[in-house]
Interface confidence: low
C-alpha cells in the first residue's frame, strides 16, 4: 500500500515499511505482514480467512484494512465456506455409504459390505460369495453372474466339467479317461505313458 509524504515528521512508515520515492511521489512500501498507507494495519490475509482454496485480497473499508475472498469454483460466501455444486451435499449414498466427490457435480459412493450400485441402493448379490470353486462373482442387474474356472461350470461353478466327454478324447493311444472333480486322469495301455498317454513307454 502507498501513501503520501512518508519522509515528513509524523508521516514515517511504521512496522518496518520503507519510504521510497518514485515519479516525485513518496510512498511506504510495506512488508507482507502489514498494509495501509503507513504500514499501520496488520495484513488481514495472514490469518488465511478464505477457506476451500479461496484467494484473499486486501481491501480498504473507510480507511481500515479488511479482506475479501475470491472463492474457488463450487464455494461461495464471505469465507468461501458455502458449497454450491457439491454433489455430496444431498447425501446420495444410502445404507451407510460414503460419498466421494469426483468433480464438483459428480460423486462416487463407497458402499459398505453387502451393498452396491451408484447410490449403494442395491443389496450386493455377491456379498454371500455365491460362486464356488474359485469362480469370480460379478453383479449383474439385480442378480449376479459367476465367471467359472475352466474345470467347473453352472450358475455357481459347482458343476464339474467332464473332461472325458471331449472329442477327440484327451487320453491318447487307447488310454482310458477317468473324470475327477476339477480334473481328469488317464490310465494308459502298457505301451504308452505320460499325463495323456502321449509318450511311448521305453
Amino acid at each position: 500500500a502507498r501513501g503520501p509524504r512518508c519522509s515528513q515528521p509524523g508521516e514515517t512508515c511504521l512496522n518496518g515499511g520503507k519510504c521510497e520515492a518514485a515519479n516525485g511521489t513518496e510512498a511506504c512500501v510495506c512488508g507482507g505482514a502489514f498494509v495501509g498507507p503507513r504500514c499501520q494495519d496488520p495484513n488481514p490475509c495472514l490469518s488465511t480467512p478464505c477457506k476451500n482454496a479461496g484467494t484473499c485480497h486486501v481491501v480498504d473499508r473507510r480507511g481500515v484494512a479488511d479482506y475479501a475472498c475470491s472463492c474457488a469454483l463450487g464455494f461461495s460466501g464471505p469465507l468461501c465456506l458455502t458449497p454450491l455444486d457439491n454433489a455430496c451435499l444431498t447425501n446420495p449414498c444410502r445404507n451407510g455409504g460414503t460419498c466421494d466427490l469426483l468433480t464438483l457435480t459428480e460423486y462416487k459412493c463407497r458402499c459398505p459390505p453387502g451393498w452396491s450400485g451408484k447410490s449403494c441402493q442395491q443389496a450386493d448379490p455377491c456379498a454371500s460369495n455365491p460362486c464356488a470353486n474359485g469362480g469370480q462373482c460379478l453383479p449383474f442387474e439385480a442378480s449376479y453372474i459367476c465367471h467359472c474356472p475352466p474345470s467347473f461350470h453352472g450358475p455357481t461353478c459347482r458343476q464339474d466339467v467332464n473332461e472325458c466327454g471331449q472329442k477327440p478324447g484327451l487320453c491318447r493311444h487307447g488310454g482310458t479317461c477317468h473324470n475327477e472333480v476339477g480334473s481328469y486322469r488317464c490310465v494308459c495301455r502298457a505301451t504308452h505313458t505320460g499325463p495323456n498317454c502321449e509318450r511311448p513307454y521305453v
Epitope: S70, L73, S76, T103, L104, T105, E106
Partner: antibody
Framework: EVQLVESGGGLVQPGGSLRLSCAAS????????MSWVRQAPGKRLEWVAY????????SYSDAIRGRFTISRDNAKNTLYLQMNSLRAEDTAIYYC??????????WGQGTLVTVSS | DIQMTQSTSSLSASLGDRVTVSCSAS??????LNWYQQKPDGTLKLLIY???NLHSGVPSRFSGSGSGTDYSLTISNLEPEDIATYYC?????????FGGGTKLEIK
C-alpha cells in the same frame, strides 16, 4: 433433445442496453446451472457470467462486472443477460450454455451483439 | 486469472492421422479441464470433461490426458468431420478461462 436458443442480439450504440434471452427445452431447466460465454470476432471464447439453479448465486468476469446482470426464470425455462453501458469491446457472439459435469455440455447457436456508433 | 495457452494455433494433418492438441495452464488446475469443438459455422460441442471423460455421443477416437499444468486432446484417426477449432477450458477457479484455440485443417 436438449435445445438452447438465444435471441435479443442486434446493433446498439455505445452506452446503450440490450437484453439477451435463452429459451431452454428438452431438459429440466431448474436442475441445471447456466452460463453465458461470448466470442469476439476472430478471438477466443470468453466466459461472461454464471448462475446457479435458483438464481441465488451469480458470478461475473471482471470485464463485465457491474454492467451485465445474469438472471433466470425457471417457470419460463429462460435464461437472461441484461447488458447495460455497452462498449465497442462487448461486440461478440453471445452463447448460452448448460452446465453439467462441471462442463458446458450443451450450447446454443449464439446471438450477435454489435456495439457501434 | 488462470491463463490457458494453446501453443499451436493451427494444425494441418491428413485423414487417418493421429493428431494431438496441447494446452497448458499458468498454474496447476487439478485435472479441472474440459475440451470443446467449434465447427466453422460456430456450433460448439463438449468433447471431454474432467481431463479424460468422453461426453456422451462423442466418438471414441477422441481422448484426453494430462495433469498439473499440461493437458492434451488426441484424435486417433482423423476424419473429415473433425475439421474444427478445439478449445481447452479450466474450471479450477472463477473466472473460467479458455485457451486460444487450435484450428485443425486437412492437408
Amino acid at each position: 433433445e436438449v435445445q438452447l436458443v438465444e435471441s435479443g442480439g442486434g446493433l446498439v450504440q455505445p452506452g446503450g442496453s440490450l437484453r439477451l434471452s435463452c429459451a431452454a427445452s428438452g431438459f429440466t431447466f431448474s436442475s441445471y446451472t447456466m452460463s453465458w460465454v461470448r466470442q469476439a470476432p476472430g478471438k477466443r471464447l470468453e466466459w461472461v457470467a454464471y448462475i446457479d439453479y435458483g438464481g441465488d448465486f451469480t458470478s461475473y468476469s471482471d470485464a463485465i462486472r457491474g454492467r451485465f446482470t445474469i438472471s433466470r426464470d425457471n417457470a419460463k425455462n429462460t435464461l437472461y443477460l441484461q447488458m447495460n453501458s455497452l462498449r465497442a469491446e462487448d461486440t461478440a457472439i453471445y452463447y448460452c450454455s448448460r452446465r453439467r459435469y462441471d462442463a458446458m455440455d450443451y450450447w446454443g447457436q449464439g446471438t450477435l451483439v454489435t456495439v457501434s456508433s | 486469472d488462470i491463463q490457458m495457452t494453446q501453443s499451436t494455433s493451427s494444425l494441418s494433418a491428413s485423414l487417418g492421422d493421429r493428431v494431438t492438441v496441447s494446452c497448458s495452464a499458468s498454474q496447476a488446475i487439478s485435472n479441472y479441464l474440459n475440451w470443446y469443438q467449434q465447427k466453422p459455422d460456430g456450433t460448439l460441442k463438449l468433447l471431454i470433461y474432467y481431463t479424460t471423460n468422453l461426453h456422451s455421443g462423442v466418438p471414441s477416437r477422441f481422448s484426453g490426458s494430462g495433469s498439473g499444468t499440461d493437458y492434451s486432446l488426441t484424435i486417433s484417426n482423423l476424419e473429415p468431420e473433425d475439421i474444427a477449432t478445439y478449445y481447452c477450458q479450466q474450471y479450477s477457479k472463477f473466472p473460467w478461462t479458455f485457451g486460444g484455440g487450435t484450428k485443425l485443417e486437412i492437408k
